[in-house]
């Protein structure tokens, strides 16, 4: 069963101080109707203490007295049952402590009841387990500000419990959020307490509030969505990758090329090879061979794995990535050592060969054909 966490959350405060969450189950305070109840907020160094009941701010009234770290309820009634919280606000953070109040006629002697599950739903006047809504997993709700690139998927969550099971509805900027408010609509998974929007666009920006309610109460939580518009750019390759590698004859090696590209990238792994005993064509450009490329039949094109290598596999390996805007290339060297020589760690440098000036390859007869490089374009 999830631990209880932050109960009330109605405003968007991206700059708020960190909050500490209570991990253990809340303590249970039991009282008979008409009795008085006094509870001390068990938090240290509290500058300011605020109280909530079932997620709603609790202020003093003719039966509720709030003095310092003490809460007093005079002449308790079953309606006072519920999940209470006191929050201590300090200069650097805030901390919340939770406890249950159960006002019922059916107070046992205590000998025959195991109270370890005391945080379960309280017993109301009619004997049924009833519970106002409460958050069951605030960890999934901590990130309130979502800055997301356009075309991405966004998921907002409000995991909650209560009895009867609460309903969940969503507001956008304080108003009912309807399917027709966005192209493609949105998905709500009630069992996961989530709202999902696919392919977000700038018009999706705004505040999204989940309202979780049953007949015993209502709680809400607000997220802010900012949609970052994409600026088209050629692929970006992570610096230092692929990295130089060394292995012994018969060993395995893997080159990795990490690609960042908003537009669909096309990845090629290219190696320098010899043709008719020569590494260069008549025009002085090197012979190259495509070892692997992205596509339907190629899994994980960002990784080039070489198995059972021979000395002939030594040399320079180029990761070439292109999209409709442009391209980028980085390369690494493979050193193949004789069996008896243990491989040392290569200095990891990324080569930038000068001759890669214009990446327009002449290779139209298959993946493993050898071809000459035609003016290969190189981008720093």
């Amino acid at each position: 069963r999830p631990s209880f966490s932050l109960v009330e959350d109605t405003t968007l405060e991206p700059e708020e101080p960190p909050t500490k969450y209570q991990i253990s189950q809340p303590e249970v305070y039991v009282a008979a109707p008409g009795e008085s109840l006094e509870v001390r907020c068990l938090l240290k160094d509290a500058a300011v203490i605020s109280w909530t009941k079932d997620g709603v701010h609790l202020g003093p009234n003719n039966r509720t007295v709030l003095i310092g770290e003490y809460l007093q309820i005079k002449g308790a009634t079953p309606r006072d049952s519920g999940l209470y919280a006191c929050t201590a606000t300090r200069t650097v953070d805030s901390e919340t402590w939770y406890f249950m109040v159960n006002v019922t006629d059916a107070i046992s002697s205590g000998d025959d009841e195991d109270d370890t599950d005391g945080a379960e739903d309280f017993v109301s006047e009619n004997g049924n387990n009833k519970r106002a809504p409460y958050w069951t997993n605030t960890e999934k709700m901590e990130k309130r500000l979502h800055a997301v690139p356009a075309a991405n998927t966004v998921k907002f969550r409000c995991p909650a419990g209560g009895n009867p099971t609460p309903t969940m509805r969503w507001l956008k900027n304080g108003k009912e959020f309807k399917q027709e408010h966005r192209i493609g609509g949105y998905k709500v998974r009630n069992q996961h307490w989530s709202l999902i929007m696919e392919s977000v666009v700038p018009s999706d920006k705004g505040n999204y509030t989940c309202v979780v309610e049953n007949e015993y109460g209502s709680i809400n939580h607000t997220y802010h969505l900012d949609v970052v518009e994409r600026s088209p750019h050629r692929p970006i390759l992570q610096a230092g990758l692929p990295a130089n590698a060394s292995t012994v004859v018969g060993g395995d090696v893997e080159f990795v090329c990490k690609v960042y590209s908003d537009a669909q990238p096309h990845i090629q792994w290219i190696k320098h090879v010899e043709k008719n005993g020569s590494k260069y064509g008549p025009d002085g450009l090197p012979y190259l061979k495509v070892l692997k490329h992205s596509g339907i039949n190629s899994s994980n094109a960002e990784v080039l794995a070489l198995f059972n290598v021979t000395e002939a596999d030594a040399g320079e390996y180029i990761c070439k990535v292109s999209n409709y805007i442009g391209q980028a290339n980085q390369s690494a060297w493979l050193t193949v050592l004789p069996k008896q020589q243990a491989p040392g760690r290569e200095k990891e440098i990324t080569a930038s060969p000068d001759y890669l000036e214009k990446l327009e390859f002449r290779h139209d007869s298959g993946l493993n054909d050898i071809f000459e490089a035609q003016k290969i374009e190189w981008h720093e």
């Epitope: 069951t136 990130k143 997301v148 991405n152 998921k155 998905k187 709500v188 998974r189 069992q191 999902i196």
Partner: antibody
Framework: QVQLLESGGGLVQPGGSLRLSCAAS????????MSWVRQAPGKGLEWVSV????????HYADSVKGRFTISRDNSKNTLYLQMNSLRAEDTAVYYC????????????WGQGTLVTVSS | DIQMTQSPSSLSASVGDRVTITCRAS??????LNWYQQKPGKAPKLLIY???NLQSGVPSRFSGSGSGTDFTLTISSLQPEDFAVYYC?????????FGQGTKVEIK
Amino acid sequence: QVQLLESGGGLVQPGGSLRLSCAASGFTFSDYAMSWVRQAPGKGLEWVSVIEGDGSYTHYADSVKGRFTISRDNSKNTLYLQMNSLRAEDTAVYYCAREKTYSSAFDYWGQGTLVTVSS
Amino acid sequence: DIQMTQSPSSLSASVGDRVTITCRASQDISSDLNWYQQKPGKAPKLLIYDASNLQSGVPSRFSGSGSGTDFTLTISSLQPEDFAVYYCQQHYSPSHTFGQGTKVEIK
């Protein structure tokens, strides 16, 4: 204990239809979302479709959208997958799987039923 | 759809080795990532859910970490019964895509 048992697989011609069933036992069926996941021979896993416990939510992989329909009969503890306009690339072992509460992790799987689409 | 990329696609290891498999999402998926193990002719088995939670009954040598786009499955000390194919799966978007799998073979 939790058990999921698929049936209804077999050989079908391209363009044909097939209905898969998944009989569930050992848990309160209506409390759980259920999914279909398939695996083509020698290939990886591909998620196909999901349906919420009360049937109020369904979703499909792009590859089957408009051709497959997921449904459930909670009174019979049974999950279904109606497959129409079948193609050769739909050939796979089809698994039904139960989703964990609060998480779309598949904690229980059936043994799978093989669907072969061939002329 | 969100793409999931696993690496390596296969690896050879010995009993007792520490094995690490990585999974990368094409966008931020928070911690909505699960790991499965599959042996030939069998249905997959859930190992880790929500990036780092060990499924009940799974040995503690399996662990998961990561959030956002980069995730890791670690087997601290490989056992004979661990030779299998491992898959990651995202459940952030409505389409719960799987990675292409990593085959762990005996060296």
